[in-house]
Each structure stands twice: as C-alpha cells, then as structure tokens.
Amino acid sequence: QDPWAAEPRAACGPSSCYALFPRRRTFLEAWRACRELGGDLATPRTPEEAQRVDSLVGAGPASRLLWIGLQRQARQCQLQRPLRGFTWTTGDQDTAFTNWAQPASGGPCPAQRCVALEASGEHRWLEGSCTLAVDGYLCQFGFEGACPALQDEAGQAGPAVYTTPFHLVSTEFEWLPFGSVAAVQCQAGRGASLLCVKQPEGGVGWSRAGPLCLGTGCSPDNGGCEHECVEEVDGHVSCRCTEGFRLAADGRSCEDPCAQAPCEQQCEPGGPQGYSCHCRLGFRPAEDDPHRCVDTDECQIAGVCQQMCVNYVGGFECYCSEGHELEADGISCSPAGAMGAQASQDLGDELLDDGEDEEDEDEAWKAFNGGWTEMPGILWMEPTQPPDFALAYRPSFPEDREPQIPYPEPTWPPPLSAPRVPYHSSVLSVTRPVVVSATHPTLPSAHQPPVIPATHPALSRDHQIPVIAANYPDLPSAYQPGILSVSHSAQPPAHQPPMISTKYPELFPAHQSPMFPDTRVAGTQTTTHLPGIPPNHAPLVTTLGAQLPPQAPDALVLRTQATQLPIIPTAQPSLTTTSRSPVSPAHQISVPAATQPAALPTLLPSQSPTNQTSPISPTHPHSKAPQIPREDGPSPKLALWLPSPAPTAAPTALGEAGLAEHSQRDDRWL
C-alpha cells in the first residue's frame, strides 16, 4: 500500500506519539491542526526522536514535504546556533539534533521562514516560505503514560483496533497513549472494549486484564451485558461497565455519568461524583462553581496581534492604529494603502471562515464601536508561572533537556511567545487565573497623564465605548480575569523591545472533533486592571473628537476630555505576581454597574520583535513558551516612547483614538 495514502498514521513510544497527516496545508494551518488535536507540530530534538520520525515517514517520494515545528521570523538569522535562529513552535531553541539539507549560508534572511522535512531519503530539513501548502505535516502528542499494545490471543478474530485520543484508528501501534481505546473481536462472535486508564497503584494500564477471548459462559450474547460479561466461579455471569460508565439498575446496561452531568463545556467520566468537568482552551473553571467556565484573555498572547488586540468571550480581534490597515493574515498592520481592502476581505472569507454567520460578527463588532485606549505604555514581560492551561496531550520532554541558558539572552531577540502548555491528565482545564507580570522602564516625568476610556450612561449600542472597568465587588471571583500588574525597572527605553507574554486563544473551529463539542458563547466580559496611578495625576477619560492642547513633541496623544473619576485602591486577593521590581498596589477605576456597556473589550498594544535585544533575565529561566506562528508583516511604527509620570505611574497611552481596521475572530487563529 502506498505510504502516502490519504490516511494519517502514527508511531507512539511510552511518552509521546508522532503522527503524519498527508494533507496539503500551509505552516499556519498545519500548526493549528496539530493544536486542535491537543498536540503541536513535531519537534524532533534528539537522534532517538528523529529515528521515530524516520520510521513513521518511511520512504516517500522526493517531491513530498512535511511541516515540522520550526519557524524563524524575518531578520532573526543566528547561523552559529544549531537551529540557525529558528525556534521550535514550543517556544525554545534547544535541540540535540539537526538535519539541515545544506550548510548555513551567510544570507541576510529578510523574510519569515519555516522548515519542512523531505519525505524521501534522509528526511533532511529544508527551509522555505511558510505560505506554501506542502504535502503534509507531522504532529507530536505528549502524554503522561502509555499502555503497551495488547498481545494477540488464540481466540481473537483479528488484531485489536486502537483509537487514540487524537482520533487515529489503527492496528499498528506498539504503545497506546493514555485515553486510547482498544477494540478486540473474538472468534466466538463477541468482543471486548478496553480503555488505557490510570491505575490505582499509579501509572497507566488497560482497564481490563486478559484473557479477553476465552470461555463460553457469556456466549452467545455476551451474557446480555452491554459492555463486559464476567463468568463467576459458580457458572453464572455478571456484567461490568468499562471505565467511565456505571452499571444501570437493570444490572446489564451501562450509563454514562456525563449524560446527566451539569458541565457547561466538557465532561470526563470518573472522580467522586462519577464525572468531572473541564473547560475548553480559552476558558477556565469558575472558582465558585467548577461546572461553569469563564473566559481567559487571549490578548495576553505575545504577537497575537501586531498592534492592538481586543479580547472577548472565547476569542479575540486584532486592530490597527489610524493610518494603518490590517494585512490579510489578520494580525499584521501595514501603512494604509499597502494592500487592497478587498484582499483583506477575500482572505477573511477564504482563510478565516469558521462557519459563523457574518451578521453575528457584525453584531459583535457593533458592541465595540467608538474610542478606546491602548493598554498604557509598553510592557516588558518576565516569565511567570504559566497558567495551568492543561491539555491531556502535548509534546513533553525530559526535564534535563529544558534550556539551561537564561531566556532571552542579550544577543537573542525574544520570539513572540506564550506560556508553554503544561501537561495534565484532564482533557482541557484551566485551574488558576492568569497572572502576567511586567516591568516598565523608568522614564522622565510625565507630560501626559494616564488615559482611560469613559463610561457613558445610556449610550445606544452603536455608540458604546469600551471601558476599563474595576473588579466588580458584587460579582463572584470567577468573573475576575487575570491581573496585569506593571512595575518599573531602571532600564533606558531605547534598548527594550516591547514584549507581551500571553496565552493561547481558543482553537476550535467549526469542524470540531468529537473530543471537543461545539459550544457557542455570546457576550463579552473583560476587565482591565490598571497599575498604580499616583494621586497627583488625574486620569483622563477619552471621548471621541474632543480636543487636547498640544503635548510634548515626542508624545503621541489621544483626543481626550479631562474628567475626574474617583480612584479607589483595592487589594487583589490571592494573587502572586512575580517581578524583580517592587509592585505598586493596583489602583482601579470604580465604574457604576448601570453605566457599563454590554461589551468591554481590552485593548493591548502588541509589538513583534525585530532585530532588537532584551536585557531581561527571567524569574523562571527554564520556563518556555509556545512560539506562535504568524506571517510576517511590516514592523509597526506605532511604538513611540512616551514619558512616564512617576516611578509608579501607569504608562501613558499610545496611538491614535481612531480605528483603522480590525479583524473579527472568535475561535479562529491568525
């Protein structure tokens, strides 16, 4: 049989699987496809892993290429490094193996590049345009344990058929990841279904021990049992249910405890109640009720948008400042007129369509119509404990291969990155709020006070302006998003690239797998927490069209109208902010609930690194973050350095209060 037949195939070891998908995709589409299944593009970092990839790929035709998880942003050449400036999609550059087709050449590498593996010969690595749709891609899935393939028994009618959690069905596995199902057909006409489960004594194993196909006491009808029939010593039979099910009152059929479970998003059998609830990517369990899920802020992902980002429930949107327009990739901004508006629309229709009604998207946009303020100033992130953003399956690597160099080094411009997903036994869950820590350089005293948008009482939906809202005292803590705390480090601004360290958005498009049932979420619930605002600086409330006297020549200002709002210091409960500089208490703007508009998007400036260096040394030097694939766009000219009012002042707002262009997205990625 042609190894390049249309069916995907996989090779698994005790702790990870590689899967080959012979589907023509661009790098971005391939990366997204792996993520949707709970994995990542393959990262063969050792000769042993490369050997497994080789055996999986086999001897394909010379014309066939497969994406692996290596990407390099424009002008990021580092030819002396083993990966030549390329970064794994898991966010790091450590490797004990490379297989480049050619020696490094000293070119300027002006464009973004991605790596594909040749399907033939020695499976060499080639670099090329990320927008080419190559013949397929390799995904990698990590897990906590695996069950060995079942031994064939005398009474079997054929080999066991295995189904993995990433939906590959085959008889050809040596190891089966935790969560796989084995179906065994016996010659006597009945069969058994086994699940690779956690064992009480630790580790994982099959839910039932063999032999599976002996005896006739349960013949001919499986003893009337829906799942498993057990022959007792005295000759009578009793029924059992496979893991995750319980025996019904009739003693024969099996019930799924999740069928009645009140989980808002996802349910997994097991646990003291017979089930446990989990949240989809982009959501986390509500603290007051683990059955419910609350939104997480995708705009915390570095590079998710080149300039500005708005978060809403289950998704996000990208925007560009006035004079710029959104490129076709939905992320990058280029000076107005650099590409046709129709092209952007075409791509929106072709590439980003996830089956949602355009009317719905328009409605979502109308809810955010008016002025806004970018997150004040420019942030420099230090890695913090990443959110417990648990996927059951992800590439996992031994601890000793975590990078031993501080990240980033002064000579290594940091990639657009987000916290690396820790592996977890739950299918998809978020168990603690996001805490993003930032530092801000000490700058000369203020010429411009911090700017926040106003709340307007009783504005029509078409005229609502997004609000930077305080924590709602009357809402349960589950509705409170992660805190963005900003502190200051004495660094001159010229040498610090803006970085925002963040998390992945929800990645479940319309063609969802059974593992992730489709759940549509409407509405917006976002809160932005401002850092300390010194008492001598009254916050300004932005309104469209209002005039402001000229500022210092180096300051880019929003059109604003000065309006005093009370500043109420509030303590943030149970929050661990990691920073090398003292963190000022959060001052938050109290907004009467009655005046809050329906949609409260959070806008963050997002700057992709160019050839700049960063002097930051991380709090957790070995924490790594997934590299977010994105297509290159021109570097934005938006990030002007603005003075800061005082050592603990909120950084000043940046950009013009005019929406140039936006990209509406929910569960679509880039």
Epitope: T26, S63, Q102, Q112, L126, T131, L132, A133
Partner: antibody, heavy 124, light 108 residues
Framework: QVQLQESGPGLVRPSQTLSLTCTAS????????IHWVKQPPGRGLEWIGY????????TYNQKFKGQATLTVVKSSNTAYLRLSSVTAEDTAVYYC?????????????????WGQGSLVTVSS | DIQMTQSPSSLSASVGDRVTITCRAS??????VAWLQQTPGKAPKLLIY???NRYTGVPSRFSGSGSGTDYTFTISSLQPEDIATYYC??????????FGQGTKVQIK
C-alpha cells in the same frame, strides 16, 4: 539533462477536444509535479493546473475545471492535457513545466524547467 | 484568487541602466514568488525563486527582493540579451498559481 517536450495537433476544430502530450526525460518522472500553462498569442501566461505523477493528484485553476483533464502515464514518462469543447479563445501556445522541489537547502515550488511550447490553433 | 499586479507594463532603457520592475500580490504570499524571463518565441525561464534567490546559472545582475505582498525585480546593468518580457508569479498553492501581466523590456 532535464528536458520537457510538448507535442500536439496544431489545428483543432471548434467544439472538439484538444489533446497535448508532454514527454519528460533526464530526471525521475514521479519525483516532480508537472504544470500546464496557456499563453494566447501576444498575451500573458495563465496557469491551467498541475498533476503529481507519483499519485495522480491533480489541482486545477477554477477557470479550467470541467474543461481541462490532466493525466500521466508513468511507464512512458508522459503527461497529457485534454481540453474539451474548444473555442477560438483556446488558441494559444501550451507549455508543460516541471515544479521544482528544492534548491540549495530551500524547498520551493517555482517552475524550474519548461517545454518549448506547442502552438494550437482552434479554427474551422 | 490571488492577483499579481505588475508594473510597468513596458519600459525602455539604455544598455547599462538599472531596471526595476515591481509586483504586488493581492494577499500575503510570503516569499512564494518567482520571476521569469521570456524572450520572443521562446519558453519562459526561471530567474528568481523564493522572492530573492537566484536560480542556478542566472547572472548576478538579476536580483529580487520582497515578502508578504510587495516584490521587486532588478536588473542592475541592462544588457542587450536582456530584451524580453518578465513575469512575476506566485505559487503558494492557495488556492492556485498566478502570473503578473508581464513587463516588456526594450533597449532605447
């Protein structure tokens, strides 16, 4: 050395089917995709579609879908273009071209070798 | 479909002149852009692939640059044998290959 050679009837009557042959030599035929490109007299280049001889996988320009059929015969290293229900608009030079795979450590899908072209006139 | 808008449609220059042709893609095609030369009565020849890489045997006076949507092809010193029509082409496969309209280069 790599060579591609188109051949065809030269003259085809309107509404009939045009058949062109592209014979490849100097390389492993199944390792490279074959493209077909149309160039009407005095005009620019227009992509018709491609076929991968390894597995007969085809991709067509939407404009030619339904009218063009691409096939290969591996044993003779030949690729075929059939264009049904031709009109005067189909009068053109037709090229077959090979899609490159990689050069100097880069993968790339540009057309690295072209045939000399075959002029087909559609006229009654 | 991805459109490739090439300009100018024709130009005249003297031997030794620097000649520049531009091409704009209607959407981001990364670096999946080639430049082809077609002399009268002949088949096109590949000069530049992947936006900026010179194909084997192509003289160094030919160069290309750009990524995303804007691309430039340059002949640093025009020679008599460079009289031809030059085409840009995108080949992302997404959804199809397309060519620019062509630029006819003549010598004054």
């Amino acid at each position: 050395q790599v060579q591609l050679q188109e051949s065809g009837p030269g003259l085809v009557r309107p509404s009939q089917t045009l058949s062109l042959t592209c014979t490849a030599s100097g390389y492993t035929f199944t390792d490279y995709v074959i493209h077909w490109v149309k160039q009407p007299p005095g005009r620019g280049l227009e992509w018709i579609g491609y076929i991968n001889p390894y597995d007969d996988d085809t991709t067509y320009n939407q404009k030619f879908k339904g009218q063009a059929t691409l096939t290969v015969v591996k044993s003779s290293n030949t690729a075929y273009l059939r264009l049904s229900s031709v009109t005067a608009e189909d009068t053109a030079v037709y090229y077959c071209a090979r899609r490159g795979n990689s050069y100097d450590g880069y993968f790339d899908y540009s057309m690295d070798y072209w045939g000399q072209g075959s002029l087909v006139t559609v006229s009654s | 479909d991805i459109q490739m808008t090439q300009s100018p449609s024709s130009l005249s220059a003297s031997v030794g002149d620097r000649v520049t042709i531009t091409c704009r893609a209607s959407q981001n095609v990364g670096t999946a852009v080639a430049w082809l030369q077609q002399t009268p009565g002949k088949a096109p020849k590949l000069l530049i692939y992947s936006a900026s890489n010179r194909y084997t045997g192509v003289p160094s006076r030919f160069s290309g640059s750009g990524s995303g949507t804007d691309y430039t092809f340059t002949i640093s010193s025009l020679q008599p044998e460079d009289i031809a029509t030059y085409y840009c082409q995108q080949y992302t496969n997404y959804p199809m290959y397309t060519f620019g309209q062509g630029t006819k280069v003549q010598i004054k």
